[in-house]
């Protein structure tokens, strides 16, 4: 088992909004849960965009999930990752 490296980034979207992206990379096996939580509960499926789980060329895998949020509300969002029985949560950087 190779645990993922998780990285959260932000980019400007439309006025007053930002897109936050949570990337998991270099993990094996390929089964992974990667999702955004808002206010501690699941963000609806429709509010998130997922990338495919793809090989990264080193025998491991990578994927991502993104959502658009209002600037100033970053604290309310965390990226949740679960892989091979381990889990972690990742805040949006300031």
């Amino acid at each position: 088992t190779v645990p993922p490296m998780v990285n959260v980034t932000r980019s400007e979207a439309s006025e007053g909004n930002i897109t936050v992206t949570c990337r998991a990379s270099s993990f094996y096996p390929r089964n992974i849960i990667l999702t955004w939580r808002q206010d501690g509960v699941s963000l609806s499926h429709d509010a998130q965009q997922w990338g495919d789980v793809l090989p990264d060329g080193n025998g491991t895998y990578q994927t991502w999930v993104a959502t658009r949020i209002c600037r100033g509300e970053e604290q309310r969002f965390t990226c949740y990752m679960e892989h091979s029985g381990n889990h972690s949560t990742h805040p949006v950087p300031s």
Epitope: I33, R37, G40, V41, Q75, F77, T78
Partner: antibody
Framework: DVQLQESGPGLVKPSQSLSLTCTVT?????????WNWIRQFPRNKLEWMGY???????NYNPSLKSRISITRDTSKNQFFLQLISVTTEDTATYYC????????????WGQGTLVTVSA | DIQMTQSPASLSASVGETVTITCRAS??????LAWYQQKQGKSPQLLVY???MLADGVPSRFSASGSGTQYSLKINSLQPEDFGSYYC?????????FGAGTKVEIK
């Protein structure tokens, strides 16, 4: 460590309003987290009532939405529960608690305060 | 709303026994589940979050498992301090709801 302490009247008459205070020590309620009220009925059923978060945004249980209000006094690091038009069915132990945004579970609770609704 | 159904409502067990409590959600809650222990006259205390993760300070005789709609809490070698009531709680969506509880009593 975050500590929470509920206070308020232990007896309220039917049709009146129930008002409770949660005093938080060890953490500023404007820094982070969602600050919640939960109640436990005499037969031990637990009910999440709602929260006010660090920025003042509220979220209520739809079963209570027409009767509940959660507010705060940031200068005293307190948040409040008001429940209007109470009946005997609102007799319960009322707890304040909080959760972090990594998941809506409750790591610490106040000691609880029993409120009896009776004429 | 997601309803949480706990079973059994109560059980009697002896010190040293293994007990299992189950919690069924009315919809898939995707491991968004917590377990609490409550002693008589005290506040609930967090035992488990994210369905399987033990909270800080919880003894390793407690374990939890499950997925989808079915979850369980297992206590190996029951100790005198484990007697009390146990509640599950989902946090998949609002409103947050709790199970009705399981009371673990001394046989």
């Amino acid at each position: 460590d975050v500590q929470l302490q509920e206070s308020g009247p232990g007896l309220v008459k039917p049709s009146q309003s129930l008002s409770l205070t949660c005093t938080v020590t060890g953490y500023s309620i404007t820094s982070d987290y969602a600050w919640n009220w939960i109640r436990q009925f005499p037969r031990n059923k637990l009910e999440w009532m709602g929260y006010i978060n660090y920025s003042g945004t509220t979220n209520y249980n739809p079963s209570l939405k027409s009767r509940i209000s959660i507010t705060r006094d940031t200068s005293k690091n307190q948040f409040f529960l008001q429940l209007i038009s109470v009946t005997t069915e609102d007799t319960a132990t009322y707890y304040c608690s909080y959760y972090r945004y990594d998941g809506a579970w409750f790591p610490y609770w106040g000691q609880g305060t029993l409120v009896t609704v009776s004429a | 709303d997601i309803q949480m159904t706990q079973s059994p409502a109560s059980l009697s067990a002896s010190v040293g026994e293994t007990v299992t409590i189950t919690c069924r959600a009315s919809g898939n809650i995707h491991n968004y589940l917590a377990w609490y222990q409550q002693k008589q006259g005290k506040s609930p205390q967090l035992l488990v979050y994210n369905a399987i993760m033990l909270a800080d300070g919880v003894p390793s005789r407690f374990s939890a498992s499950g997925s989808g709609t079915q979850y369980s809490l297992k206590i190996n070698s029951l100790q005198p301090e484990d007697f009390g009531s146990y509640y599950c709680q989902h946090f998949w969506s609002f409103p947050l709801t709790f199970g009705a509880g399981t009371k673990v009593e001394i046989k």
